[in-house]
Interface confidence: low
């Protein structure tokens, strides 16, 4: 036998106590699939969260973060304070990257400068709190008589740690 509730479309719920009538979801609730016996409560974007997409009868609200904060977690479940480039967020707040590390984003953690010597290269441009070092040709490549200059390694994508 077919479940009569299966006829209830998204945006409604199946009323068990009213002979399986399909009733519209109440304000501030939604059902994203058919055949539901209750509607889900809409997410409320309050405080540091702001509404990116309003709740509808068939889909939940989506939140992002107010300026000065960024999303963390699936579906922006948390907002974390932004820091400046060259800083990272600690329990005590935003702290400058320690010597030998950098952060070129307004979130995330300080990462170690690339060790150019691992690739047999030398430091072409020194690193800062905000920028990684730039590796250049190896010292051998710069010696007189060298026939060619090895191009620097491709830049890493932001947010990726050195391998």
């Amino acid at each position: 036998l077919q479940d009569p509730c299966s006829n209830c479309p998204a945006g409604t719920f199946c009323d068990n106590n009213r002979n399986q009538i399909c009733s519209p979801c109440p304000p501030n609730s939604f059902s994203s699939a058919g055949g539901q016996r209750t509607c889900d409560i809409c997410r409320q974007c309050k405080g540091v969260f702001r509404t990116r997409k309003e709740c509808s009868s068939t889909s939940n609200a989506e939140c992002d973060c107010t300026p000065g904060f960024h999303c963390l977690g699936a579906g922006c479940s948390m907002c974390e304070q932004d820091c400046k480039q060259g800083q990272e967020l600690t329990k005590e707040g935003c702290k400058d990257c320690s010597f030998g590390t950098f952060n070129d984003e307004e979130h995330g953690v300080c990462r170690p400068w690339t060790d150019c010597s691992l690739d047999g290269k030398s430091v072409l441009v020194n690193g800062t709190k905000e920028r990684d070092v730039v590796c250049g040709p190896s010292p051998a490549d710069l010696s007189p008589g060298a026939s060619s200059v090895t191009p620097p390694a491709p830049a890493r994508e932001p947010g990726h740690s050195p391998q």
Epitope: S23, N28, G35, Q36, T38, D40, I41, Q44
Partner: antibody
Framework: QSVEESGGRLVTPGTPLTLTCTVS????????MSWVRQAPGKGLEWIGI?????ITYYASWAKGRFTISKTSTMVDLKITSPTTEDTATYFC???????????????WGLGTLVTVSS | AIELTQTPSSVSAAVGGTVTINCQAS??????LAWYQQKPGQPPKLLIY???YLASGVPSRFKGSGSGTEYTLTISGVQSADAATYYC????????????FGGGTEVVVK
């Protein structure tokens, strides 16, 4: 249709504990579920809900102290760091709704007793 | 957060008498209220939903009424089996509800 809680026992303060609610005769994809607790000789206290789509809602006092999750036939309640104030019978209950939009508990388990003591 | 205040906390009634329990919400809950009966060692049992609708299998001597912020559960022709604690519960789509239940009313039948 039935709801049954398990996992309640004596634990020392700070020892995480997970309670399990096993349902039969209905689908967790159709019904939201809730956890409610009752300290000895006290009233009913709502902890939180897990919706059909897995969204969780907690009473403000319960946020960070409890975590609700589910599989296809079970709903778990994790007490993250129990204190003696968490000593209670924990009930799992099914939520239902109708066209006046009331959410009410139409099926309850018998409850499982958690005792937190050093 | 919506708060529910139940009065009285305890009431005594003779068999055949009438008991009235009140539930006041801190703000309007638009008839989104349920009543439960709980006996010692048992889980709560749904009696009334949507303020006035009788749940399946509940005797007609139980009656719910009210609207806005004021709600009442009336038990007419009280029987010894009605000795229990009764709780009101606010609607669940109000996600800010800190405690969905009133404090409870103990009914003692003489």
């Amino acid at each position: 249709q039935s709801v049954e809680e398990s996992g309640g026992r004596l634990v020392t303060p700070g020892t995480p504990l997970t309670l399990t609610c096993t349902v039969s005769g209905f689908s967790l994809s159709s019904y939201a579920m809730s956890w409610v607790r009752q300290a000895p000789g006290k009233g009913l206290e709502w902890i939180g809900i897990i919706s059909t789509s897995g969204i969780t809602y907690y009473a403000s006092w319960a946020k960070g102290r409890f975590t609700i999750s589910k599989t296809s036939t079970m709903v778990d309640l994790k007490i993250t760091s129990p204190t003696t104030e968490d000593t209670a019978t924990y009930f799992c209950a099914r939520l239902n709704g109708f066209d006046d939009y009331v959410r009410y508990f139409d099926f309850w388990g018998l409850g499982t007793l958690v005792t937190v003591s050093s | 957060a919506i708060e529910l205040t139940q009065t009285p906390s305890s009431v005594s009634a003779a068999v055949g008498g009438t008991v009235t329990i009140n539930c006041q919400a801190s703000e309007s809950i638009a008839s989104n209220l349920a009543w439960y009966q709980q006996k010692p060692g048992q889980p709560p049992k749904l009696l009334i939903y949507a303020a006035s609708y009788l749940a399946s299998g509940v005797p007609s001597r139980f009656k719910g009424s009210g609207s806005g912020t004021e709600y009442t559960l009336t038990i007419s022709g009280v029987q010894s089996a009605d000795a229990a604690t009764y709780y009101c519960q606010s609607a669940f789509y109000v996600s800010s509800s800190d405690n969905a239940f009133g404090g409870g009313t103990e009914v003692v039948v003489k």
